[in-house]
């Protein structure tokens, strides 16, 4: 009679983490009696997996009944695969005794866990940024396997080309993560723009992972400001409006100083959104001239998003307007020379408010 | 080590029924078939029949067919012969053995219960 | 049913010689290469013990002046050098079919 052999026929078998791993193993004879058992690797360290004899091993089932006479087919299941499981498998052999001594070995198959990489999650800065800055988005997958993987970035579907990528660990592992930054140059039209970081990897069979950072919470638009004097309303009122115009966020503080002293605050609430995702807002300041004796300095101070404030100054010539001298109205008396329309009962001057 | 330890002895009248129980330690219990063999006092050994604990597969001497049945608890790796409808020739040492080869051989076995007949 | 017929009955051999007990089938025992016969020996008061298997392969264990041999219909089991320790019944058991034992061949010192 020949010699027992233990033929394990696949070299390798790849797997995609969750299904099921069958290891082909088979004996070429009945001689010598005795057990099969299962290991991951080799030597003193060696994992068992499955041992014919005794033991509990709720992942494994054997592909052929073991207790069938003449069976020679000692292939396993393993249930459940992870990434953890990766490893070469060794089919052993042992020799019926007190104990059961190894006979011999299979040559061993190579499992490799096909896993897919986790969705892709893409970062910004911490802090917002203004147009013409550059900033970094980071993106990170994890868990794939095997290694070899393809990451891109766009910018609105345009691909991007300044970034670095990093596949770890280097060496051999059981499952491995990815981590790329890219640089992308902000403008001002930016604030619907979104960043994609694409991940294409074997396990996902042609259908990249994808994720996203939408700008509008990395950009910052500074506004321009505009103070402008309108026609005369009334024969001692002047319309002074202050335009807010192209900023991002919405988060704005608008302050009215007349000669430095400040008049009113009031905080962005109903603006209008302009196509590229940018705000405009205007406000009012009615000014009684016949409360001035001198020329009036008007500014208009806006803080936008937490940011040093801006300002812009406008010049009201109260000499413009010498029947309003010396007049004596309500405003003068409280010492107040600016309304909101919130002072006033008349839809027309409502409408004239700043809110718009 | 594989152990395969069997009830006490027996004592029965003709006629009724017998079972013998075996529990198994040291290997997978549903792994291997469990033989039962008999000797009757200063004969040779008989076998009766086998079970594949896995799924309770079994195969009889025609001789024992009609009058045994085996069984096994795999909660507590335990097989079972009874035997019924007793008579004096039955009265004999009951082994079980368990085949580590599934060759339908017998490597391990009990140290035997003996059933005792008489009226 | 395959039928094993050991022979002789009853033998007595002297210490330190070699002593051998047959066992023949009523059909070939052979199947996919392997002869399915076996040995066991069997002292008082003690369950068998396997000697041999698949009619010439010794149980781990088993001393090697025990020895099996044969094919097809006709088997022998060999104690080159009887020692006094090997006093015990003999049986043969086939498992070509389902199992049959021989009668038993019980081996003394003369």
């Known amino acids: 009679e020949e010699e027992l052999q233990v033929i394990q026929p696949d070299k390798s078998v790849s797997v995609a983490a969750g299904e099921s791993a069958i290891l082909h193993c088979t004996v070429t004879s009945l001689i010598p009696v005795g057990p099969i058992q299962w290991f991951r690797g080799a030597g003193p360290a060696r994992e068992l997996i499955y041992n014919q004899k005794e033991g509990h091993f709720p992942r494994v089932t054997t592909v052929s009944e073991s207790t069938k006479r003449e069976n020679m087919d000692f292939s396993i299941s393993i249930s459940n695969i992870t990434p953890a499981d990766a490893g070469t498998y060794y089919c052993v052999k042992f020799r019926k005794g007190s104990p059961d001594t190894e006979f011999k070995s299979g040559a061993g198959t190579e499992l490799s866990v096909r896993a897919k990489p986790s969705a892709p999650v893409v970062s910004g800065p911490a802090a917002r940024a203004t147009p013409q800055h550059t900033v970094s988005f980071t993106c990170e997958s994890h868990g794939f396997s095997p290694r070899d993987i393809t990451l891109k970035w766009f910018k609105n579907g345009n691909e991007l080309s300044d970034f670095q990528t990093n596949v770890d660990p280097v060496g051999e592992s059981v499952s491995y993560s990815i981590h790329s930054t890219a640089k992308v140059v902000l403008t001002r039209e930016d604030v619907h723009s979104q960043v994609i970081c694409e991940v294409a990897h074997v396990t996902l069979q042609g259908d990249p992972l994808r994720g996203t950072a939408n700008l509008s919470e990395t950009i910052r638009v500074p506004p321009t400001l505009e103070v402008t004097q309108q026609p005369v309303r009334a024969e001692n009122q002047v319309n002074v409006t202050c335009q807010v115009r192209k900023f991002y966020p919405q988060r704005l503080q608008l302050t009215w100083l007349e000669n430095g002293n400040v008049s009113r605050t009031e905080t962005a609430s109903t603006v209008t959104e302009n196509k590229d995702g940018t705000y405009n807002w205007m406000s009012w300041l009615l000014v009684n001239v016949s409360a001035h004796r001198d020329d009036v300095k008007l500014t208009c101070q806006v803080e936008h998003d937490g940011q040093p404030a801006v300002s812009k100054s406008h010049d009201l010539k109260v000499s413009a307007h010498p029947k309003e001298q010396g007049s004596n109205t309500a405003a003068e008396n409280t010492g107040s020379n600016e309304r909101g329309s919130s002072d006033y009962k008349d839809d027309d001057d409502k409408h004239h408010h700043h809110h718009h | 080590q594989v152990q395969l330890v069997q009830s006490g002895a027996e004592v029965k009248k003709p006629g009724a029924s017998v079972k013998v129980s075996c529990k198994a330690s040291?290997?997978?219990?549903?792994?291997?078939?469990i033989n039962w063999v008999r000797q009757a006092p200063g004969q040779g050994l008989e076998w009766i029949a086998m079970?594949?604990?896995?799924?309770?597969?079994?195969h009889y001497n025609q001789i024992f067919k009609d009058r045994a049945t085996l069984t096994t608890d795999t909660s507590t790796s335990t097989a079972y012969m009874e035997l019924r409808s007793l008579r004096s020739d039955d009265t004999a040492v009951y082994y079980c053995?368990?085949?580590?080869?599934?060759?339908?051989?017998?490597?391990?076995w009990g140290r035997g219960t003996l059933v005792t007949v008489s009226s | 049913d395959i039928v094993l017929t050991q022979s002789p009955d009853s033998l007595a051999v002297s210490l330190g010689e070699r002593a051998t007990i047959n066992c023949r089938a009523s059909?070939?025992?052979?199947?996919?290469?392997?002869?399915?016969i076996f040995w066991y020996q069997q002292k008082p008061g003690q369950p068998p013990k396997l000697l041999i298997y698949?009619?010439?392969n010794l149980d781990p264990g088993v001393p090697d002046r025990f020895s099996g041999s044969g094919s097809g219909t006709d088997f022998t089991l060999t104690i080159s050098s009887l020692q006094a320790e090997d006093v015990a019944v003999y049986y043969c058991?086939?498992?070509?079919?389902?199992?049959?034992f021989g009668q038993g061949t019980k081996l003394e010192i003369k």
């Open positions: 059909k070939s025992v052979s199947s996919s290469g392997y002869n399915y």
């Open positions: 698949l009619a010439s």
């Open positions: 058991q086939h498992s070509r079919e389902l199992p049959t």
């Open positions: 053995a368990m085949d580590y080869g599934s060759l339908y051989a017998m490597d391990y």
């Open positions: 040291g290997y997978t219990f549903t792994n291997y078939w």
């Open positions: 079970i594949d604990p896995s799924d309770s597969e079994t």
